[in-house]
Interface confidence: medium
């Protein structure tokens, strides 16, 4: 029976997950009466950033006043579909996925804003949203058409702890380099000076030797 | 095979509270494609739905019993309760646990039923 | 709250003979209703939901059909463990309500 819930799936992408082996087509054909269709909208294409993160919105129209909602994403690839994460949330409140999910949302009105992370290569993909309006009666279901998710990997960066250290060395020993040059240049300075001089020659007239002044006392009449 | 066993059926006293438990076996309460419910019956008559839980503790009353109605779950015993309060002798009936699937608001499995008798 | 209103109440019928229940709803429903089997000091047990689909494991003898306010319960031939009481319940809306029951006895 196509239309089960979903069982609650603790994530991660590329480790061993829940698939079902049948294709979405086969999920979608074999939906039961007792499941009452409803519309959701998501983009065709999202290419995710560089650190691995996708982001889409996911709009859904409802028929009716939902105050339950669950929303889940699936992901399709290779004829098999995954359970990627899922949330169960009270109309106005936020959206909470497990503790440990890969997925992040909010919501706001028939709109649901979801983010997954941590993101690589191998985990391009169809990615569609799966809404249920669970309270009150009664129960609709509603499927995206499923947005492609481009994972591109990075070029691979040094260790960043590693980076670190290198970044270090090289200031440390530019320092060093720049004080032993300091130290060098100015010694060399110092050899080519008199030790008494100034480093400016002035011709001066010569001098008698000190002698002690002999200071006259003034008087100063006050009237 | 799923299994439902209702247990804290007796005689309570008018003004009281009634307590109930369901423990389910052969199945997870944590399942998230299914609700948990109460049914009563009065002896004689037909059948009032009461309430639902859903695993993460999400829950929806009968609005004519909401007032006195709580109804909990306990993941790690596989089991929810209910309890309700003020009770008079118009709350006398068998008390039935059922489980629903997300998607049907009608109940496919049951547990065999415990009397409550509201009596002084 | 959406009343569900079910006849007859009690019918005698035969063992081989085809029962017809019926059960009205005071609003549409569209086809959220279920039906229950239910034999005295037991729990009820479902036979269809969504208004025509059939329990597993329930004989094919029992079928439903309806949709908006009026439904129909039907035993194409009644066979002796058959006798017992049947509930129709909606699941449209907040509360979920049961008709009244119908009684089938044997005649």
């Known amino acids: 029976m196509a239309c089960l819930g979903f069982q609650r799936h603790k994530a991660q992408l590329n480790l061993a997950t829940r698939t079902w082996p049948c294709t979405l087509l086969f999920f979608l054909l074999f939906i039961p009466v007792f499941c009452k269709a409803m519309h959701v909208a998501q983009p065709a294409v999202v290419l995710a950033s560089s650190r691995g993160i996708a982001s889409f919105v996911c709009e859904y129209a409802s028929p009716g006043k939902a105050t339950e909602v669950r929303v889940t994403v699936l992901r399709q690839a290779d004829s098999q579909v995954t359970e990627v994460c899922a949330a169960t949330y009270m109309m106005g409140n936020e959206l909470t996925f497990l503790d440990d999910s890969i997925c992040t949302g909010t919501s706001s009105g028939n709109q649901v804003n979801l983010t997954i992370q941590g993101l690589r290569a191998m985990d391009t993909g169809l990615y569609i949203c799966k809404v249920e309006l669970m309270y009150p009666p009664p129960y609709y279901l509603g499927i995206g058409n499923g947005t492609q998710i481009y994972v591109i990997d990075p070029e691979p960066c040094p260790d960043s702890d590693f980076l670190l250290w290198i970044l270090a060395a090289v200031s440390s020993g530019l320092f060093f380099y720049s004080f032993l040059l300091t130290a060098v240049s100015l010694s060399k300075m110092l050899k080519k000076r008199s030790p008494l001089t100034t480093g400016v020659y002035v011709k001066m007239p010569p001098t008698e030797p000190e002698c002690e002044k002999q200071f006259q006392p003034y008087f100063i009449p006050i009237n | 095979q799923l299994q439902l066993q209702e247990s804290g059926g007796g005689v309570v006293r008018p003004g009281g509270s009634l307590r109930l438990s369901c423990t389910v076996s052969g199945g997870s309460i944590s399942s998230s494609s299914y609700y948990w419910g109460w049914i009563r019956q009065p002896p004689g008559k037909g059948l009032e739905w009461i309430g639902n839980?859903?695993?993460?503790?999400?829950?929806y009353y009968n609005p004519s019993l909401k007032s006195r109605v709580t109804i909990s779950v306990d993941t790690s015993k596989n089991q929810f309760s209910l309890k309700l309060s003020s009770v008079t002798a118009a709350d006398t009936a068998v008390y039935y646990c059922a489980r629903r699937r997300i998607q049907l608001w009608s109940f496919d499995y049951w547990g065999q039923g415990t009397l409550v008798t509201v009596s002084s | 709250d959406i009343q569900m209103t079910q006849s007859p109440s009690s019918l005698s019928a035969s063992v081989g003979d085809r029962v017809t229940i019926t059960c009205r709803a005071s609003q549409g429903i569209r086809n959220d209703l279920g039906w229950y089997q239910q034999k005295p000091g037991k729990a009820p047990k479902r036979l269809i939901y969504?208004?025509?689909s059939l329990q597993s494991g329930v004989p094919s003898r029992f079928s439903g059909s309806g949709s908006g306010t009026d439904f129909t319960l039907t035993i194409s031939s009644l066979q002796p463990e058959d006798f017992a009481t049947y509930y129709c319940?909606?699941?449209?809306?907040?509360?979920?309500?049961f008709g009244g029951g119908t009684k089938v006895e044997i005649k």
């Open positions: 969504a208004a025509s």
């Open positions: 319940q909606q699941s449209y809306s907040n509360p979920l309500t």
């Open positions: 839980i859903y695993y993460s503790g999400n829950t």
